[in-house]
Interface confidence: medium
């Protein structure tokens, strides 16, 4: 055909029929077989999808190409001829490739290659498992830490490369007829206490524990300074009743009588149980605060000093006495509203809640644990409504500048005590910066609408007296007669009502 009779505008993938018409090349299509419009285009025909009848056969895949198509074997398969492509099912000779034979080092150390149709897998030898980051690399299974618990609880698991052993723990021996090593090893405790193999000091009692023994102070005794209890080398001394004497410079017959009674209890301490002593002290305190007698005649600041001294002493005495209590829960309440709750527990990983009529305390048991002391922990709470009698007209010291809260508007106004005063203590006396907060829920007298409610603690001043403060305590929520407080230290706590409306709040307290 003369090139002058050929259309110059024919699109890509087409050829001219004459001077005014074009036709798509094989493998391409347009809206009609012959077209005369210069805007027409030739699209690739995808032979791999219907209505095309192309079939490549098993273990293969059709791949569309520009103007044509190819058949290729699936990954892990190849043509017998070694060629890469073919055109139809009749030419399909795809067969599985044995990757394991092709590359013997495909599975790394401690692994065996297993050929599969179109692929391969690595299997680890017994006692090994795949590394998560490399499914071809086998690594030793630590049967001891894998959670399979292959050994009897009386034995100690020792991991080896590809295997493990079960050996008797220190202080244990194989039961008669049992080996010491294979996974069927079973051991029994050696009772060092009854067999005389222990080395406990005479001031202690030997306690056989599973697999070992410890030396614990005799009841009413305490570890010598710097020596922990419940160790093999514990040495103890006779425990004395914690000293609690009247505050210096305070002249009150009522208070003297209280401390005389407390000292009497201290003198009798060895013959009484700690529980009875705690009950007796609480009864005396309850009666003291129900009828404070001449304490009322003391100047205000001295009343505050007495309260500080009582709150401090309570904490120390109860912490000391509670060391002699057995595991369990104690709840005492007294006529004038004094309440005492205490729980003694071995190390446990859970929250503890102590509930009283007017207050609840919730904290995590690990706060109570004294570091290095494996003995039981103590959490205690004392509610002392009557302490409010000694804490009238107490200033509130605000956080940022440690200033007494006063300004032009609120000159001379003092906060109002709404709740009981509660005192919290733990066996751990390092409670100034707790690793997790303690939550207190107070029931209290009604709040006057629009008045700010504050969670406070009793802070002992330099002069041994004290004031209310908010540092480290936040008010989580308050309703008419209940407030939730969260504190990061322990002391004595209460809920106060600020002496002004919320709308004209003192900025130092916001």
């Amino acid at each position: 055909q003369d090139s002058r009779d050929c259309a110059r505008w024919c699109p890509e993938n087409s050829s001219c029929v004459n001077a005014t018409a074009c036709r798509c090349n094989p493998g391409f299509s347009s809206s009609s077989e012959i077209f005369t419009s210069p805007t027409e285009i030739c699209d690739d025909i995808n032979e791999c999808v219907p209505p095309s009848k192309v079939s490549c056969g098993k273990s293969s895949d059709c791949r569309n190409t520009e103007g044509s198509y190819d058949c290729v074997c699936n990954p892990g398969y190849e043509l017998v001829s070694g060629a890469k492509t073919f055109k139809n099912e009749s030419e399909n000779t795809c067969q599985d490739v044995d990757e394991c034979q092709q590359n013997p080092r495909l599975c790394k150390s401690y692994g065996t290659c297993v050929n599969t149709l179109g692929s391969f897998t690595c299997q680890c030898l017994p006692g090994f498992k795949f590394k998560p980051e490399d499914p071809k690399l086998c690594t030793d299974v630590n049967e001891c830490t894998s959670g399979q618990n292959p050994c009897h609880s009386s034995t100690h698991c020792l991991n080896n490369v590809g295997s493990y052993q079960c050996r008797c723990r220190p202080g244990w021996q194989p039961i008669p007829g049992s080996p010491n090593g294979p996974n069927n090893t079973v051991c029994e405790d050696v009772d060092e206490c009854s067999s005389g193999l222990h080395q406990c000091d005479s001031s202690t009692i030997c306690f056989n524990t599973v697999g070992l023994y410890t030396c614990r102070c005799r009841p009413g005794w305490e570890p010598k300074h710097g020596i922990p209890n419940n160790q093999k080398d514990t040495v103890c001394k006779d425990m004395h009743f914690p000293t609690w004497t009247p505050p210096p410079g305070v002249h009150s017959q009522t208070l003297s009588q209280f401390f005389n009674k407390v000292q009497d209890l201290g003198r009798d301490f060895k013959t009484r149980s700690a529980k009875v002593t705690i009950q007796s002290i609480l009864k005396e305190l309850d009666e003291l605060l129900e009828a404070p007698g001449d304490l009322e005649t003391l100047p205000r600041f001295q009343q505050h000093c007495v309260a500080t001294h009582l709150l401090d002493g309570l904490e120390d005495v109860f912490r000391g006495l509670s060391k002699n209590l057995s595991i369990g829960l104690l709840n005492f309440s007294y006529p004038a509203g004094t309440e005492f709750s205490l729980e003694v527990q071995k190390q446990v990983d859970r929250n503890v809640t102590l509930r009283q009529n007017q207050a609840t305390m919730q904290l995590h048991w690990n706060l109570a644990q004294k570091s290095g002391d494996p003995g039981p922990s103590v959490v205690g709470l004392v509610s002392v409504p009557g302490m409010g009698k000694l804490l009238a007209e107490v200033p509130l010291v605000s956080e940022p500048e440690n200033q007494v809260v006063r300004n032009e508007t609120h000159q001379g106004l003092l906060p109002i005590l709404l709740s009981d005063i509660i005192s919290a203590f733990l066996s751990n006396n390092d409670t100034q910066n707790l690793s997790s907060p303690v939550t207190f829920t107070f029931s209290h007298r009604s709040v006057i609408p629009r008045q700010k409610v504050l969670c406070v603690f009793w802070e002992h001043g330099q002069n041994g007296c004290g004031h209310w403060a908010t540092t480290g305590c936040s008010t989580m929520g308050t309703r008419d007669t209940s407030t939730i407080c969260r504190c990061t230290h322990l002391s004595s706590f209460a809920v106060l009502m600020a002496p002004y409306d919320v709308q004209e709040e003192d900025p130092v307290l916001t």
């Epitope: 009828a291 009322e296 007294y334 006529p335 004038a336 509203g337 009238a392």
Partner: antibody
């Protein structure tokens, strides 16, 4: 509903004794002290003493020691006051009351009138 | 013992008027004071605790104030249902003691 229901009026002879009761309902009997008060005709109120039902602990106004004796029965949630060696001076209305949040009395009994007359 | 003195045994006030009842303690009682209302033939009823806390069920025309030894119960806009005897009580020290009472009447 918190209630303290007292026993009926008593007419007693001088020198005799009388035991009046106070039946509690609507709150925990063992959680609160129960107090007793005396009100003589056209006179004010006097605090006699209290009983703590939890353990039977009692406390008396010195003025009424030997005159009043307080007891409680937990099973029937009832508090009792026995008055002995009665004279005309003891003629009064006697009230029991529940201790409130502190030491005020937030719920009072109905009152029992004791008349001492020959 | 702490003596509680209510200066007026009787007070006669006109309807809608304002009443002030006073109570004086022989010693400081640090606001540990309650007021009771007693109507004829009935038991006393707690009206105010801790010197200023109005109990639920009483209207806001009743209020309490004071500190140290001197305390006051105020009633604004006296109503007929307020006719009663009012007692103060200290609960700072045992024995708990009451004032002699103030009988309120309408003139």
């Amino acid at each position: 509903q918190v209630q303290l229901q007292q026993s009926d009026a008593e007419l007693v002879k001088p020198g005799a004794s009388v035991k009046i009761s106070c039946k509690v309902s609507g709150f925990s009997f063992t959680d609160h002290t129960i107090h007793w008060m005396r009100q003589r005709p056209e006179q004010g109120l006097e605090w006699i003493g209290y009983i703590y039902p939890t353990d039977g602990n009692t406390r008396y106004n010195e003025k009424f020691k030997g005159k009043a004796s307080l007891t409680a029965d937990k099973s029937s949630t009832t508090a009792y006051m026995q008055l002995s060696s009665l004279t005309s001076e003891d003629s009064a209305v006697y009230f029991c009351a529940k201790r409130g949040y502190y030491w005020y009395f937030d719920v009072w009994g109905t009152g029992t009138t004791v008349t001492v007359s020959s | 013992d702490i003596q509680m003195t209510q200066a007026s045994s009787y007070l006669s006030v006109s309807l809608g008027g304002r009443v002030t009842i006073t109570c004086k303690a022989s010693d400081h009682i640090n606001n540990w004071l309650a007021w009771y209302q007693q109507k004829p033939g009935n038991a006393p009823r707690l009206l105010i605790s801790h010197a200023t806390n109005l109990e639920t069920g009483f209207p806001s025309r009743f209020s309490g104030s004071g500190s140290g030894k001197d305390y006051t119960l105020s009633i604004t806009s006296l109503q007929t249902e307020d006719v009663a005897t009012y007692y103060c009580q200290q609960y700072w020290n045992i024995p708990y003691t009451f004032g002699g009472g103030t009988k309120l009447e309408i003139e």
